[in-house]
């Protein structure tokens, strides 16, 4: 249930995709992956107000618990709903080689 | 990849399974669902301090570039990795049904 | 614009050693790693190996290796393969490509080809 | 090693005729595949990569699609200077792997 779509608190201040460039270095890769020397990470970024991107049943009791008891049930939080492989050349014991990660770039975000 | 189970904040104070009890009209049910009359909502609640439960490379990625940019990217989320199922008795157009709901209760936390 | 060029075409006879050259330009050599890929007459690509233009790490095609040996000069960002005993069947255009900015392991662009006949 | 396996090898087409092209993996490879066309003489140059995504510069007449072990290069509308050859190539392990090609000629 991907309930609303529309930010009530303005344009790109809600949950969504986020480009951020980051050098093996910035992720504590550069030890191991040789290629690429960067990475454009999407990651998903923004606030989760009432029923926005709900993933589930329980983002939606998360968001009702939280309009009641703010101090003990944090928000819906905003996370990848979905990813798109990567594929990195790395160093291996053995040598160089093609590796695909299926977790490592976010395709799409929700709240939950 | 769930590393560190190990919470550097302090006993209780990482990303863990927490038990919220809520009447149907704290959860703004009470007009459809006839029982149970009290859920206890099992929820993820807590800090992602570094590593801590990083579901995986993508949390690993946002631990990295959190603690480059702080005010970009935020730390991983304390989200649900699965969930119980649970069945309610509600009111339907044609009467009273049983319905099972697999992503109502968390049944498990991870960072992401 | 990025472009990979070439050194010009050799006869060898079998037995000797070629070492083509990559010239690159237009992006920051040591960012993308550059591969060889050879064609002989009438046939289709051959891979010949990988070099990480950064760390210098490589790969080889298996049935290649120990005749092959792929290097880079940072300083004139030029990539170099070396072909050592030389037979009839490695008469070919050699290629060198770099890895592709959107995929690592697809490739683009590429040079312009070295023809090298191996002939006595 | 991964084997591709690319059919038909050749295919007689009209100007504006809809070409496709498939391209078989012997064990998956996510969508890691890469298309290439190469006119006589020339070196190849990058139509697709990643499966489906359209190189920078390329006519959107060309599409690819597929994951796992199958995948398909299209021309929607063949032009003339589209005859030419086209190979797969597949990028999720080395030794990076070429399909045989397929020659597009004018019928």
């Known amino acids: 249930a991907r309930n609303g779509d529309h930010c009530p608190l303005g344009p790109g201040r809600c949950c969504r995709l986020h480009t951020v460039r980051a050098s093996l270095e910035d992720l504590g890769w550069a030890d191991w992956v040789l290629s690429p020397r960067e990475v454009q990470v999407t990651m998903c970024i923004g606030a989760c107000p009432s029923q926005f991107r709900a993933a589930n049943m329980h983002a939606q009791i998360k968001t009702s618990l939280h309009r009641l008891k703010p101090d003990t049930v944090p928000a819906p939080c905003c996370v990848p709903a979905s990813y798109n492989p990567m594929v990195l050349i790395q160093k291996t014991d053995t040598g160089v080689s093609l590796q695909t990660y299926d977790d490592l770039l976010a395709k799409d975000c929700h709240c939950i | 990849a769930r590393n560190g189970d190990h919470c550097p904040l302090g006993p209780g104070r990482c990303c863990r399974l927490h038990t919220v009890r809520a009447s149907l009209e704290d959860l703004g049910w009470a007009d459809w669902v006839l029982s149970p009359r009290e859920v206890q909502v099992t929820m993820c609640i807590g800090a992602c301090p570094s590593q801590f439960r990083a579901a995986n490379m993508h949390a690993q990625i946002k631990t990295s570039l959190h603690r480059l940019k702080p005010d970009t990217v935020p730390a991983p989320c304390c989200v649900p990795a699965s969930y119980n199922p649970m069945v309610l008795i509600q009111k339907t157009d044609t009467g009273v049904s049983l319905q099972t709901y697999d992503d109502l209760l968390a049944k498990d936390c991870h960072c992401i | 614009q990025v472009q990979l060029v070439q050194s010009g075409a050799e006869v060898k006879k079998p037995g000797a050693t070629v070492k083509v050259s990559c010239k690159a330009s237009g992006y920051t050599f040591d960012s993308l790693g550059m591969s060889w890929v050879r064609q002989a007459p009438g046939q289709g690509l051959e891979w010949m190996g990988y070099?990480?233009?950064?760390?210098?790490?490589?790969v080889y095609a298996q049935k290649l290796q120990g005749r092959v040996t792929m290097t880079t000069d940072t300083s004139t960002s030029t990539a170099y393969m070396e072909l050592r005993s030389l037979r009839s069947d490695d008469t070919a255009v050699y290629y060198c490509?770099?890895?592709?900015?959107?995929?690592?392991?697809?490739?683009?662009?590429w040079g312009q080809g070295t023809l090298v006949t191996v002939s006595s | 090693d991964i084997q591709m396996t690319q059919s038909p090898s050749s295919v007689s087409a009209s100007v504006g005729d809809r070409v496709t092209i498939t391209c078989r993996a012997s064990q998956g490879i996510s969508r890691w595949l890469a298309w290439y066309q190469q006119k006589p003489g020339k070196a190849p140059k990058l139509l697709i990569y990643?499966?489906?995504s359209l190189q920078s510069g390329v006519p959107s007449r060309f599409s690819g699609s597929g994951s796992g072990t199958d995948f398909t290069l299209t021309i929607s509308s063949l032009q003339p200077e589209d005859f030419a050859t086209y190979y797969c190539q597949q990028g999720a392990s080395f030794p990076l792997t070429f399909g045989g090609g397929t020659k597009v000629e004018i019928k």
């Open positions: 990643a499966a489906s």
């Open positions: 070099i990480s233009t950064y760390s210098g790490d490589t």
């Open positions: 490509a770099r890895e592709s900015g959107q995929q690592v392991s697809a490739l683009d662009p």
